[in-house]
Amino acid sequence: KNLKSPQKVEVDIIDDNFILRWNRSDESVGNVTFSFDYQKTGMDNWIKLSGCQNITSTKCNFSSLKLNVYEEIKLRIRAEKENTSSWYEVDSFTPFRKAQIGPPEVHLEAEDKAIVIHISPGTKDSVMWALDGLSFTYSLVIWKNSSGVEERIENIYSRHKIYKLSPETTYCLKVKAALLTSWKIGVYSPVHCIKTTVENELPPPENIEVSVQNQNYVLKWDYTYANMTFQVQWLHAFLKRNPGNHLYKWKQIPDCENVKTTQCVFPQNVFQKGIYLLRVQASDGNNTSFWSEEIKFDTEIQAFLLPPVFNIRSLSDSFHIYIGAPKQSGNTPVIQDYPLIYEIIFWENTSNAERKIIEKKTDVTVPNLKPLTVYCVKARAHTMDEKLNKSSVFSDAVCEKTKPGNTSK
């Protein structure tokens, strides 16, 4: 009896694992083995596919074959008993195009109100993704074990910290990788669960902000208790992208080590141009807080996010404020090529009651003023990028008197 060729050959590639599956064409014939050949582009001869010769099952693994993953290959299969079937040719394919990204490895660390997630590619030193290691991004789904309500977090890197969690609560999560440059979305990791710790005695510092004053950066934060010391550390933001490396060498800012105030001042030349992460920790001598939320600090934006310059045109019941580009030391305007929001604070000169206006426009009307009254105005700029969330310092206050009652038109 002539042996029939196997049919429906499927090639599954996950990371560096190459698996072939096929259907027996004739279940009634026993003791049949199967063998594969492969052929590279531009070659005429077929080569035996190692790992896939004389296979008794309907699955084989040819991961040991060192292929150029960007080069098209063709496969063929036949059945063998005393005689052999004809070859069945599989459509040619390029391994890289066919490959799926496998589940990443996940390592969790718990604090009282935060979880640190370390993510590594599922296959260490993968050949398939050798040129794409730094391009991996990850997304995760996290939920409280007790509720099951899922939250999705997209576009994270190999280290991510989730804040504002509840103490002594079990959270579960799963992570998948993506190579957006190749339109590839991976498969989810197994579910990992971790319980946050009991609430720490000392909370972490909050509301960290960086501003520029003269040639210095001023770092400010809020803290619940008095008589504390603080330390500040920085890390190059790009290091969070480094696959497989989970040793993060946070560095001290020398002028911000063991400071007793909720701010510290350090020279701009501490940082070269770049994007950094900053974090603050509090200590009372006996106990130490966990680190604050990490804020992103871009020297380019920070250095040039100067307070706005503005002119006031006074009417009887309002001010018209015209915001211009801030001036550098040489009186040349700074070009700010990112969108800004302006915060304008104004108050009656004789009062402390401040009112605030937030505007995207550079011409702003301050309404409902009293005639012949001195009002003071100061302004600052904010970036509109949520992730950067930077603010300039306030401009110096400018005080003007409103006109008499009949000049409002």
Epitope: H107, E109, N245
Partner: antibody
Framework: QVQLVQSGAEVVKPGASVKVSCKGS????????MHWVKQAPGQGLEWIGR????????KYAPKFQGRVTITADTSTSTVYLELSSLRSEDTAVYYC???????????WGQGTLVTVSS | DIQLTQSPSFLSTSVGDRVTITCKAS??????VVWYQQKPGKSPKVLIY???YRVSGVPSRFSGSGSGTEFTLIISSVQPEDFATYFC?????????FGQGTKLEIK
């Protein structure tokens, strides 16, 4: 494979100094932290300090601050522990260890016995 | 400095027994705890890191758990090669500190 090989045993007099070395191979020391740990005879482990060989930044346990110096020579992949003003309670085995992923001291040297005796 | 207190300091046990060693921290260290095994005349060897992650190559009879201030190392069925001293260590804050050790002896 990763290896940390330490210098040989030392017998030194009280008040003197000693410098112990630890040579790493199978990895780039600049990518890691390098730690030193003390173990007195029959006692537990005490962390002395660590260095980041990439920029020579050091951290010391307050107990050892001022009397120990940790340095690194990246050209020879070697880190050093210098102990000064030695006294009898400094008699111990000193271990170097690599600080790797998740800040774990994952590989340790074989230890160097320093005996302080007059 | 963060104090770590291990208990018991000595433990006599037999092959096949289940053993539990605890480590208490004087303040919350998250899950930043490492467990080491040390045999006489040898360097310490990492068994467990980040409280519960077993190092590759360490037998599955070793497991770690806990968070905050209380941590546990369990050996589910003690083998002859497990008789050694075990140390916990916190890596949450400098200076790193170790527990005083638990010596596991043959009964």
């Amino acid at each position: 494979q990763v290896q940390l090989v330490q210098s040989g045993a030392e017998v030194v007099k009280p008040g003197a100094s000693v410098k112990v070395s630890c040579k790493g191979s199978g990895f780039n020391i600049k990518d890691y932290y390098m730690h030193w740990v003390k173990q007195a005879p029959g006692q537990g482990l005490e962390w002395i300090g660590r260095i980041d060989p990439e920029d020579a930044e050091t951290k010391y346990a307050p107990k050892f601050q001022g009397r120990v110096t940790i340095t690194a020579d990246t050209s020879t992949s070697t880190v050093y522990l210098e102990l000064s003003s030695l006294r009898s309670e400094d008699t111990a085995v000193y271990y170097c260890a690599r600080g790797g992923n998740f800040y774990v001291m994952d590989y340790w040297g074989q230890g160097t016995l320093v005996t302080v005796s007059s | 400095d963060i104090q770590l207190t291990q208990s018991p300091s000595f433990l006599s046990t037999s092959v096949g027994d289940r053993v539990t060693i605890t480590c208490k921290a004087s303040q919350n260290v998250g899950t930043n705890v490492v467990w080491y095994q040390q045999k006489p005349g040898k360097s310490p060897k990492v068994l467990i890191y980040s409280a519960s992650y077993r190092v590759s190559g360490v037998p599955s009879r070793f497991s770690g758990s806990g968070s905050g201030t209380e941590f546990t190392l369990i050996i589910s069925s003690v083998q002859p090669e497990d008789f050694a001293t075990y140390f916990c260590q916190q890596k949450n804050n400098y200076p790193y500190t170790f527990g005083q050790g638990t010596k596991l002896e043959i009964k």
